[in-house]
Interface confidence: low
């Protein structure tokens, strides 16, 4: 069952995912001036079985000016390093997730991909968070956020995280910012969600919203 | 990558109703982009009317029409809305459809910047009589 939203927001933090439930897609994303080959996959499919894990689909990105050929070209060091500015500043200490039964690892990088990556998570993904540089972490409870199911809605937990500048004095102890439990943010909690208008939360999710992302493809 | 046509522009009196979508096309999954609308009167900068996360989950309104305009999006339809109520003349503008690549690692949850969007429709037409 696909997540109906996305994890929450936290305030100069990021978040990853040590390893991807089965399930779970990535689009297939090519860099500018290039593009999916035409019979490329929309799409890899972390699929698997009691002991085996592995991504279906391969993603192939051709030049955009080229129409029949799959011209692979070796990305540049600036390039490689401008994929790592959307990684975590520093190694994730948390389990290995990428050992458990039903989860796929980071699936290594394509030819030519975006410097982003798009995935579409299932139930029971967790992912964990981490204040990006020059933000330091205050804790009030787990740092992480997992996909659950209520009452047939799914819902991702909220983090207990907040990342305060090096220079900033906190207000922590005393701070008014109310806190939704660690087991996720009521409706109304839209304080860690960051936008220069309020948030207002949807409660009604497209019945087709199971189904839409495999029927959404055009030529 | 994603294209955008906005539709249902046109003339409303002041206090009345309008409805306009914006349909996506692309060889994508409409559900990796965040959907918002901007309008831009003669003039003037486009501005943030609202956007919505690319499941509907969260929205967010400029103060100008916040209680008067909602904007959905219906993913199997590859398509946003927006829903005019109690219009004003100040209303009057091309109001503009535009996306953004969800990121899963930066990003933010629903973008208000114009400059956040990577693809835009042509626009459509609303004009707000008194």
């Known amino acids: 069952e696909l997540c109906d939203d996305d994890p929450p927001e936290i305030p100069h933090a990021t978040f990853k995912a040590m390893a991807y439930k089965e399930g779970t897609m990535l689009n297939c994303e090519c860099k500018r001036g290039f593009r999916r080959i035409k019979s490329g996959s929309l799409y890899m499919l972390c699929t698997g079985n009691s002991s085996h894990s592995s991504w279906d689909n391969q993603c192939q990105c051709t030049s955009s000016a080229t129409r029949n050929t799959t011209k692979q070209v070796t990305p540049q060091p600036e390039e490689q390093k401008e994929r790592k500015t959307t990684e975590m500043q520093s190694p994730m200490q948390p389990v290995d997730q990428a050992s458990l039964p039903g989860h796929c690892r980071e699936p290594p990088p394509w030819e030519n991909e975006a410097t982003e990556r798009i995935y579409h998570f299932v139930v029971g993904q967790m992912v964990y968070y981490q204040c990006v540089q020059g933000y330091r972490a205050l804790h009030r409870g787990p740092a992480e956020s997992v996909c659950k199911m209520t009452h047939g809605k799914t819902r991702w937990t909220q983090p207990q995280l907040i990342c305060t500048g090096e220079m900033e004095t906190s207000q922590f102890p005393g701070e008014e910012k109310p806190q939704a439990s660690p087991e996720g943010r009521p409706e109304s909690e839209t304080s860690c969600l960051v936008t220069t208008t309020d948030f207002q939360i949807q409660t009604e999710m497209a019945a087709t919203m199971e189904t839409s992302i495999f029927t959404t493809e055009y030529q | 990558e994603v294209q955008l046509v906005e539709s249902g522009g046109g003339l409303v009196q002041a206090g009345g109703s309008l409805r306009l979508s914006c349909a996506a096309s692309g060889r994508t999954l409409y559900s990796s982009y965040g959907m918002a609308w901007f309008r831009q009167a003669p003039g003037k900068e486009r501005d943030f009317v609202g956007s919505i996360s690319r499941y509907g989950t969260y929205t967010s309104y400029a103060d100008s029409v916040k209680d008067r305009f909602t904007i959905s999006r219906d993913n199997a339809k590859s398509t946003v809305y927006l829903q005019m109520n109690n219009t004003k003349p100040e209303d009057t503008a091309v109001y503009y459809c535009?996306?953004?690549?969800?990121?899963?690692?930066?990003?933010?949850?629903?973008?208000?910047?114009?400059?956040?969007?990577?693809?835009w429709g042509q626009g459509t037409q609303v004009t707000v009589s008194s």
């Open positions: 535009a996306a953004y690549t969800y990121s899963g690692s930066f990003y933010s949850t629903v973008k208000t910047h114009r400059d956040e969007y990577q693809y």
